[in-house]
Amino acid sequence: GSQHIRAEKAMVDGSWLDLAKRSKLEAQPFAHLTINATDIPSGSHKVSLSSWYHDRGWAKISNMTFSNGKLIVNQDGFYYLYANICFRHHETSGDLATEYLQLMVYVTKTSIKIPSSHTLMKGGSTKYWSGNSEFHFYSINVGGFFKLRSGEEISIEVSNPSLLDPDQDATYFGAFKVRDID
Amino acid sequence: GSQHIRAEKAMVDGSWLDLAKRSKLEAQPFAHLTINATDIPSGSHKVSLSSWYHDRGWAKISNMTFSNGKLIVNQDGFYYLYANICFRHHETSGDLATEYLQLMVYVTKTSIKIPSSHTLMKGGSTKYWSGNSEFHFYSINVGGFFKLRSGEEISIEVSNPSLLDPDQDATYFGAFKVRDID
Amino acid sequence: GSQHIRAEKAMVDGSWLDLAKRSKLEAQPFAHLTINATDIPSGSHKVSLSSWYHDRGWAKISNMTFSNGKLIVNQDGFYYLYANICFRHHETSGDLATEYLQLMVYVTKTSIKIPSSHTLMKGGSTKYWSGNSEFHFYSINVGGFFKLRSGEEISIEVSNPSLLDPDQDATYFGAFKVRDID
């Protein structure tokens, strides 16, 4: 009898190890999306960036969905969201139309159920990029901890998209689930 | 018999609490490394920063290794990586060689198996630090979520290292494991 | 006998699912606090910001306490701390006292047991906000991984508080627990 119970206990431990490992992995959605520079819109006003890579280089996604330029939440939870946006201009990449620039990023959340869009985080700077210098660069980083529900969508808006740095190490955003909602 | 089973159950619960707690702790490597200003290289070109503290003040490390100026991954996983780099100049430190500066940070990953180095994240700004002001300061923050394999190395490169702020609250980088690789 | 053991096993599994879920939730304190702009101090020197929302809009708190302008740790652990601080000025708000500004944030930790305050993270920039431009903006982001003990307090100090952007997506700070202390 005692031997049988020990076998049962081992089975409990074993199945639990599997279950814990499995549930832990399944409980942690994440995404790291990098800019797809082949289709960056022009303009200096705030525009939504819809072209991102999710499966090449550093870009990856798990238990979240990327669709129509938006990162879609599949699992309720508290997530850490972040974005890194780099702007750059070299004299060879076109002449600046103005030296006074507003270089901004807005991380927005859209709820499908109640069609509404809200800015979760913003960052940036006004810059004076004079023609006296042949190269200009500026990066913005924002991050924060937010409650996200399944079906909600995260998107990125920037000003002056024509100045975006197209490198995967420069312009990206992402999210990872930290914990469940109580 | 029933009493015996209950004792076994308690043992299962107890061992599980220990196991879960232990495995959870072991599964979460981290590091927060602060600049060691006694050995900052000079120059304005991009250089790798090799001197960091790992065990004093805010600096700490667990289940990762710091060696030869690089943060070495001991455990496969998805990690959140971050860096905060501060640059500063006071007129008492001497004149700047140029007023047009490129203040940059690059967080790089090196794989030993396939000797190659790749930039995971970059940030910074071009700055005009005019002689009209006696003090100049600028900070960069970058962060992102990356898959790291055991043996891979994380390092920090900056431009204008002679302008680095040597305080532990100013110039640091770190990582913490968020989840296993499926 | 065997049937009884299976029932016990099911009970172990069931209680463990509950226990694991419950302990996981309880083990993860967090806070995301957004600026309360009704009570921002004036001046250009470094001041502690004491008015933050913890329960409206994006602001939230769990298993941590907000009191007297400080975020109080209730549970020992390693936490990721972050802050995003935005400064802005429009010419309609009046002339700036000086065009040379030091826009800074300091994330500090205070220990009650040993009354002392230490800066964990700092960031910012010196800026030249010339009268030639009608609008100026600048954001700072800092983040890092720190060991916090129950009873320790996190607070935010900034320079030039009168220039703070009062939006909840602009000026905020937060923390979330990543792991226990060994």
């Epitope: 520079a37 289709d39 960056i40 819109p41 022009s42 303009g43 200096s44 006003h45 201009h89 004299e91 060879t92 990449s93 076109g94 002449d95 600046l96 139309a97 103005t98 030296e99 006074y100 620039l101 004079s130 023609g131 006296n132 002056n160 024509s162 100045l163 | - | 030639n132």
Partner: antibody
């Protein structure tokens, strides 16, 4: 309605100078970058020079660098092109053009003035 | 600098026909930053398309632009008598901004 009216063209000898003007109306002149584009008789279009809305930054084609100077007087809503050391190959219709202002880098040209003819000949 | 080559040099078509004009760049045009203009004899050029495919204000929908990278196309779905002119492409993705040599669309 946006209007651009060029003046100052004419016949000039090689090595000589000429100053073109462009009077702008119908928009907030100081908010927009402006350029000069030229077209040699029977030939294609060539961008010559550009200037930011504030006048703080100026840009030139290699073919005119060091010889031409673009400037603007925002109080008079007027764009200028000072042309020195003129050559026969500078003979063209010079158009004053507005940058659309919807991008941070100078972009397409819209609208165009009717142009003024510059002839460099001895 | 980026060299833009337009083809054909001349296109002879009848009203009602479809016109397809090509503009090829010597290197990739950043961000599809390419514009098309129409110029009639004795007149200044007029903007038709910007951003490779966006129609300018007041331009009829028979004019359409497409392409990316190094290959761009202007299509006039059904030629009207007033459409016969010279058409130029222009890139603004790098400095200096450059024009193609033009394609003349003439009545057959």
């Amino acid at each position: 309605e946006v209007q651009l009216l060029e003046s100052g063209g004419g016949l000039v000898q090689p090595g000589g100078s000429l100053r073109l003007s462009c009077a702008a109306s119908g928009f907030t002149f100081s908010s927009y970058a402006m350029s000069w584009v030229r077209q040699a008789p029977g030939k294609g279009l060539e961008w010559v020079s550009g200037i930011t809305g504030s006048g703080g930054s100026t840009y030139y084609a290699d073919s005119v660098k060091g010889r031409f100077t673009i400037s603007r007087d925002n109080s008079k809503n007027t764009l200028y092109l000072q042309m020195n050391s003129l050559r026969a190959e500078d003979t063209a219709v010079y158009y004053c053009v507005k940058d659309p202002g919807t991008t941070s880098i100078m972009s397409w040209f819209d609208p165009w003035g009717q142009g003024t003819l510059v002839t460099v000949s001895s | 600098e980026i060299v833009l080559t337009q083809s054909p040099g001349t296109l002879s078509l009848s009203p009602g026909e479809r016109a397809t004009l090509s503009c090829r760049a010597s290197q990739s045009v950043r961000g599809r930053y390419l514009a098309w203009y129409q110029q009639k004899p004795g007149q200044a050029p007029r903007l038709l398309i910007y951003g490779a495919s966006s129609r300018a204000t007041g331009i009829p929908d028979r004019f359409s632009g497409s392409g990316s990278g190094t290959d761009f196309t202007l299509t006039i779905s059904r030629l009207e008598p007033e459409d016969f002119a010279v058409f130029y492409c222009q890139q603004y993705g790098s400095s200096p901004r450059t024009f193609g040599q033009g394609t003349k669309v003439e009545i057959k």
